[in-house]
Amino acid sequence: LTCLGGFASPGPVPPSTALRELIEELVNITQNQKAPLCNGSMVWSINLTAGMYCAALESLINVSGCSAIEKTQRMLSGFCPHKVSAGQFSSLHVRDTKIEVAQFVKDLLLHLKKLFREGQFN
């Protein structure tokens, strides 16, 4: 799943079912957002690079009591090879930048969409 190198191939490769479900969940969150997501909770911004799934989980796991992102948290844990607990941080975090959960989710979704369009849209 961390190998996304195949996108330079002649045709696009659709994501695995698990990744497809993660994208769909992020879409649901961004489209169905009525009130401020997670009461406007702030999380550390991350570098959207190779280890982004773990980094995203490390950031989001610090948000508790927010049912809207619980499914996303569970899904991300399936993409991260190691156990992640609250307060844990990797070098992928931009430690001086905090953003709202809603923006974090939107950024993650945009990045995933960009990954799957690479190699097919010129």
């Epitope: 045709g11 696009p12 490769v13 659709p14 994208i23 879409v27 369009r117 849209f121 010129n122």
Partner: antibody, heavy 119, light 107 residues
Framework: QVQLVQSGAEVKKPGASVKVSCKAS????????IHWVRQAPGQGLEWMGA????????AYNQKFKGRVTMTTDTSTSTAYMELRSLRSDDTAVYYC????????????WGQGTLVTVSS | EIVLTQSPATLSLSPGERATLSCRAS??????LHWYQQKPGQAPRLLIY???QSISGIPARFSGSGSGTDFTLTISSLEPEDFAVYYC?????????FGGGTKVEIK
């Protein structure tokens, strides 16, 4: 509600160009790709290509490469499809449709634009 | 290019009967297969996505199944408004392709 409204019917001469517009409303335009599909009279559906409004990136069916150009104007949430060097077999209804990502289905379609190529 | 072959080309049935439409892909496309209904003078309408996922607002009599190369759209009991042309679509890889269509007509 989501709507894709296309420009009106066109009659063109062989060798000419046509530019069909598709105005989107009811959703965030840059969140979805716009795909173009055509249907010749009494025939099936044929995918022409797609554009990502966020980046302007395009993907064209090899069959139309060099003759088709897809563009968007994000300020008006409008997508355009221009087909050049028209031939009589380009006579068809041209549809725009939106897709979240290419592997998703085309969940909303425009009403179609009939382009007739005749001398 | 992934070629989708739909069969039969025409299906003649009566209201109340069960319709079974087939779509075969030239290579494995997992469940990246979508079904559309088209009536004369109208744009196609999405019925089923990812081979078997239903769409809200689409009657429950429409169902899809299959994975890999063989897919089926089933209409459990035909209503008068179901007589139309049905297309399958490859969502797996570019170029996106459609089957030739199956026309469901009144017997």
């Amino acid at each position: 509600q989501v709507q894709l409204v296309q420009s009106g019917a066109e009659v063109k001469k062989p060798g000419a160009s046509v530019k069909v517009s598709c105005k989107a409303s009811g959703y965030t335009f840059i969140d979805y790709e716009i795909h173009w599909v055509r249907q010749a009279p009494g025939q099936g559906l044929e995918w022409m290509g797609a554009i990502d409004p966020e980046t302007g990136g395009t993907a064209y069916n090899q069959k139309f490469k060099g003759r088709v150009t897809m563009t968007t104007d994000t300020s008006t949430s409008t997508a355009y499809m221009e087909l050049r060097s028209l031939r009589s077999d380009d006579t068809a209804v041209y549809y725009c449709a939106r897709i979240l990502l290419y592997y998703y289905p085309m969940d909303y379609w425009g009403q179609g634009t009939l382009v007739t190529v005749s001398s | 290019e992934i070629v989708l072959t739909q069969s039969p080309a025409t299906l003649s049935l009566s209201p109340g009967e069960r319709a079974t439409l087939s779509c075969r892909a030239s290579q494995n496309i997992s469940d990246y297969l979508h079904w559309y209904q088209q009536k004369p003078g109208q744009a196609p309408r999405l019925l089923i996505y990812y081979a078997s996922q239903s769409i809200s607002g689409i009657p429950a009599r429409f169902s899809g199944s299959g994975s890999g190369t063989d897919f089926t759209l089933t209409i459990s009991s035909l209503e008068p408004e179901d007589f139309a042309v049905y297309y399958c679509q490859n969502g797996h890889s570019f170029p996106l392709t459609f089957g030739g269509g199956t026309k469901v007509e009144i017997k």
